[in-house]
Structure formats: structure tokens, C-alpha cells
């Protein structure tokens, strides 16, 4: 006869491990008992369980309530056991010793490997600002046994670097993603991908990039200078910029306060029916936590085109 077993049994933390030990013998042979032991390089061989043809399963104190026989139907020649709720401390070498009649004793050893799936965490780096050099965008850490693989999935151009720390029963892997911040990266996903034999599928954690910037300001509304004439209604100037965080807008007049009736609504300056008093230099101020910008335009309101006695003004922008 011979023992059918497995050199390596792999199980995920918390699952039940089946330690196989099946005696394949002649029809007239009987298995008297199967003694299971934990083989420890420091402590030697320690009793784990005894499967006896007469009194069934007896389990050693340290494994009480954790060792069972596989569910029926059971073959009398099957000495396999179930180790419930495998923990990291269970990882190691096990031995089954089968006493048969009349063939004698047989023994086999196997290794139990307990996979500890990682629980990854992603930590964003310091705030990203346009104009910085190579900067840490995010780091991703995963600890498991064996060591997990940590990579990045993104369309953003950057560099990744990994380092690992070995603990007594596991390893922690940290991967960092560095980039040169630019406004085009804003809102782009940066995904940490963790692979491990104990995971059914890769774990993914996505971080959305935020790059602080403030674009140059410009003013729209003076494209057709002939529209800026006395009496015109609904004339507006709009300040154009963009930024992250979104900027705040403010309007001032360079040569004095804003004329009465002129209203500021966010990025837009709204005029009442135009008069020549609305002529002047207007300044749009744009700011966010990162920076501030300004753009100025000169408004010249033309005399009423139906009154030929009035001089025609020109409109210019700077």
C-alpha cells in the first residue's frame, strides 16, 4: 500500500484547510489509526489529532474545536482532516502517520501555506501644483503573505518605484507614483492595482488627480467695437480664465470707482444703457489659493450713430 497526499496545501486565511492523507492498500487491509502531528523546527513534533478506527477523532488541546473529519461519506481508509478557519500561525509542516494491519506504518509530510490577502490603502501625496518639478502623486501600500504585487494603471505620464518590508509572517509593499504636474492631468484617474494569489481578482483603488493651476486671464465682449455706442442695452464684459481650485473673479475700474448702475456678477460685468461716462479702463482680477491674474481692457463708448454732430470714438483693448 501507499499514502496518497499532497506536498503543498494552499488555503486563504480564514478558510478551512483539508490536509489529505489517504491509504491506498489491498482490499483486506485495515487502517487502525491515523496520527496527525505538527512538525516544528524549534519545538519538534507536536500531537495535533488522532483518527482512530475505534473511537473516532481525538484532537489535541491547542486545536480543540478546529480539527474535524471531512463530511460524510467517509472512506475507512481516508485519514484526511479539516483544519477550520486557518490562521497564519497554522502555516508550516504537518505529518500524518498511518498504522495499518497487516502492512504496518506509513507516514507522509506536507506543507500548509496560508495565503493572507492584502488590504491595500492609497495615500495621496502633497498638493500638486502646476510648475512643480517631479512630485509624489500618491503611494499605495499592501501587506500580505506572500508579498503582494503593487502596480499603477493610468494614462498619465509618470514614474513608479516600489519598496518592500519583510515581517515575520508577511511582507508590506509600497509603490509610489511620481509625476510632473500639469493642468492636463486634472481629473485624470490614477489607479493602484494590487495582485495576490489569495485574491480572486485584482484589487483596484482609484485616486482622481487634482493639479492646482490658474490660467492667464482675458476679457471677452469687445470683439465688435461698433456695438459699444451710447444707448446700447445689455452690454457685458466677461472675464475668461480657468483654474483649480476654481478661481474667484472681481472687477475694478482703473481710473475710479465703477460707474453707478454697473453690476458685477461673478466673472461678468454688466452695464446699464451705455453713456459716454462708461468709457474707461476696466480690470478683471482672477485669483485662487495658488495665484492671481489680471487683465485690463479700455472701453470707449461711441456717440449715438444717429447724431452726426457727435464725434465717433474708437474702442481699444489691451
Amino acid at each position: 500500500g501507499e499514502l496518497e497526499t499532497s506536498d503543498l496545501v494552499t488555503v486563504v486565511l480564514g478558510q478551512d484547510a483539508k490536509l489529505p492523507c489517504f491509504y491506498r492498500g489491498d482490499p483486506d487491509e485495515q487502517v487502525g489509526q491515523v496520527a496527525w502531528a505538527r512538525v516544528d523546527p524549534n519545538e519538534g513534533t507536536r500531537e495535533l489529532a488522532l483518527l482512530h478506527s475505534k473511537y473516532g477523532l481525538h484532537v489535541s488541546p491547542a486545536y480543540e474545536d478546529r480539527v474535524e473529519q471531512p463530511p460524510p461519506p467517509r472512506d475507512p481508509l481516508d485519514g484526511s482532516i479539516l483544519l477550520r478557519n486557518a490562521v497564519q500561525a497554522d502555516e508550516g509542516e504537518y505529518e500524518c502517520r498511518v498504522s495499518t494491519f497487516p502492512a504496518g506504518s506509513f507516514q507522509a509530510r506536507m506543507r500548509l501555506r496560508v495565503l493572507v490577502p492584502p488590504l491595500p490603502s492609497l495615500n495621496p501625496g502633497p498638493p500638486l501644483e502646476e510648475g512643480q518639478g517631479l512630485t509624489l502623486a500618491a503611494s499605495c501600500t499592501a501587506e500580505g503573505s506572500p508579498a503582494p504585487s503593487v502596480t499603477w494603471d493610468t494614462e498619465v505620464k509618470g514614474t513608479q518605484s516600489s519598496r518592500s518590508f519583510k515581517h515575520s509572517r508577511s511582507a508590506a509593499v509600497t509603490s509610489e507614483f511620481h509625476l510632473v504636474p500639469s493642468r492636463s492631468m486634472n481629473g485624470q484617474p490614477l489607479t493602484c492595482v494590487v495582485s495576490h494569489p489569495g485574491l480572486l481578482q485584482d484589487q483596484r483603488i482609484t485616486h482622481t488627480l487634482q493639479v492646482a493651476f490658474l490660467a492667464e486671464a482675458s476679457v471677452r465682449g469687445l470683439e465688435d467695437q461698433n456695438l459699444w455706442h451710447v444707448g446700447r442695452e445689455g452690454a457685458t464684459l466677461k472675464c475668461l480664465s480657468e483654474g483649480q481650485p476654481p478661481p474667484k473673479y472681481n472687477w475694478t475700474r482703473l481710473d475710479g470707482p465703477l460707474p453707478s448702475g454697473v453690476r458685477v456678477k461673478g466673472d461678468t460685468l454688466g452695464f446699464p444703457p451705455l453713456t459716454t461716462e462708461h468709457s474707461g479702463v476696466y480690470v478683471c482680477h482672477v485669483s485662487n489659493e495658488l495665484s492671481s491674474r489680471a487683465s485690463q481692457v479700455t472701453v470707449e463708448v461711441l456717440a449715438d450713430p444717429e447724431d452726426p454732430g457727435k464725434q465717433v470714438d474708437l474702442v481699444s483693448a489691451s
Epitope: E43, E47, A49, L50, H52, K54, H58, S60, P61, E64
Partner: antibody, heavy 118, light 109 residues
Framework: QVQLVQSGAEVKKPGASVKVSCKAS????????MHWVRQAPGQGLEWMGI????????TYAQKFQGRVTMTRDTSTSTVYMELSSLRSEDTAVYYC???????????WGQGTLVTVSS | SYVLTQPPSVSVAPGQTARITCGGN??????VHWYQQKPGQAPVLVVY???DRPSGIPERFSGSNSGNTATLTISRVEAGDEADYYC???????????FGGGTKLTVLG
């Protein structure tokens, strides 16, 4: 080598309690069950119960249910057996014994004589 | 509860074979263990699991178990074998350990 060393002899009055200790050495304390067996003068062996030194769980013989308490201290590798409401019939030598899988006893303590007398 | 029955005493001459029986209902389906106890001493395991011997126990001690009787056999008996002998089983149904009443082995002469 494996050793089980028990506490010394005790004399108790009826109705009192006695607590006997058994200190284990020479092996992994939490790796083996510990049993208590008593023997009255000129009588046979009588099983009292079992304790799991690892988890602390116990099983007591039906005869002693409610009167016996078995505990353990893993820091000192010691098990204890306390018997309450003592009567003269409890006069006996009390043994701790290391249990093997299959429930037999491969090592025994030297025994502790408990005398119950008014 | 399960009961084990032993003869109170067995006498045998030195060099002869002593047989100590342990009776119990269908005891052959259980594993039987045997202990030797000398006066004033703790018991010593001499046979376990029907017929296995712990290290240090002479080959003269052997055991068998079938039907309703388990037997401890001591061949070539010596004066030093004089002692009380106890059989023991674990009763699966009640989860209790059961001892026989003990047998006093007397070595004649």
C-alpha cells in the same frame, strides 16, 4: 523530562473546600490535556474530569458535577482542582495525569493526600 | 454508564504467565489501556490502545481485546510485577473516562 509536581497534603473539615495544584514541566503545557483522578484508601481509581490547558475548557465526571472546578494558569504551567462541600468520603489521594490523544495517561503526578475529618 | 469488571485478585508463580481480564459490553469496539500501581506510588501506563507498549515497558507485558473481554498478559512473571492493575477506557457516548475496579496480582513464593 516530563514532570508533574503536586502540592502537599491537606487536612480539611467537612463542608470546606480544597484546592490542589499540579505544576507541569518538561513539555509544552498547552499541548496536552490534563486529567484529575482520585483514589480513596484501599479503593480503586476514580476519574474526576479533564481540562484543556490551551483554551481552559473542562469536562467533569457526572458524579462531581457542581462540586469540582478545574482551572489553569498558562504563565506558570499549573493546573488546579478545587473540590467544595467536602465530606469524609472525599478523603483520598488526588492525582493529576497528562492525557494523550485517545484518552490514556502517560505521566502522573506524585499524588496529594486530602483528609476530610471533623 | 459504562462498567468495566476485573477480578479482584490473580495469583501466579514466578516464571509463569499471568492473565488479567477486563470485561465490558462490546469492549472490543473500544481502546483499552492498562496501568500498574505499586503500594504508595502513582499508577504507571503499561499498555495502551489494546496492545501497544510505552517505551521502557518490558516486552513481557502484552494486551489483547475482542468481543466483551480485554486481557493483559504478563509472561515470565517476576516478583517485581506484584501490584494492582487497572484497565481503562474512554466511553464515547458519555464522554467520560472509566476505570475497572482493579486486580491485585500476587506473585507466589
Amino acid at each position: 523530562q516530563v514532570q508533574l509536581v503536586q502540592s502537599g497534603a491537606e487536612v480539611k473539615k467537612p463542608g470546606a473546600s480544597v484546592k490542589v495544584s499540579c505544576k507541569a514541566s518538561g513539555y509544552t503545557f498547552t499541548g496536552y490535556y490534563m486529567h484529575w483522578v482520585r483514589q480513596a484508601p484501599g479503593q480503586g481509581l476514580e476519574w474526576m474530569g479533564i481540562i484543556n490547558p490551551s483554551g481552559g475548557s473542562t469536562t467533569y465526571a457526572q458524579k462531581f458535577q457542581g462540586r469540582v472546578t478545574m482551572t489553569r494558569d498558562t504563565s506558570t504551567s499549573t493546573v488546579y482542582m478545587e473540590l467544595s462541600s467536602l465530606r469524609s468520603e472525599d478523603t483520598a489521594v488526588y492525582y493529576c495525569a497528562r492525557g494523550r490523544l485517545g484518552t490514556y495517561f502517560d505521566y502522573w503526578g506524585q499524588g496529594t493526600l486530602v483528609t476530610v475529618s471533623s | 454508564s459504562y462498567v468495566l469488571t476485573q477480578p479482584p485478585s490473580v495469583s501466579v508463580a514466578p516464571g509463569q504467565t499471568a492473565r488479567i481480564t477486563c470485561g465490558g459490553n462490546n469492549i472490543g469496539s473500544k481502546s483499552v489501556h492498562w496501568y500498574q500501581q505499586k503500594p504508595g506510588q502513582a499508577p504507571v501506563l503499561v499498555v495502551y490502545d489494546d496492545s501497544d507498549r510505552p517505551s521502557g515497558i518490558p516486552e513481557r507485558f502484552s494486551g489483547s481485546n475482542s468481543g466483551n473481554t480485554a486481557t493483559l498478559t504478563i509472561s515470565r512473571v517476576e516478583a517485581g510485577d506484584e501490584a494492582d492493575y487497572y484497565c481503562q477506557v474512554w466511553d464515547r457516548s458519555s464522554d467520560q473516562v472509566v476505570f475497572g475496579g482493579g486486580t491485585k496480582l500476587t506473585v507466589l513464593g
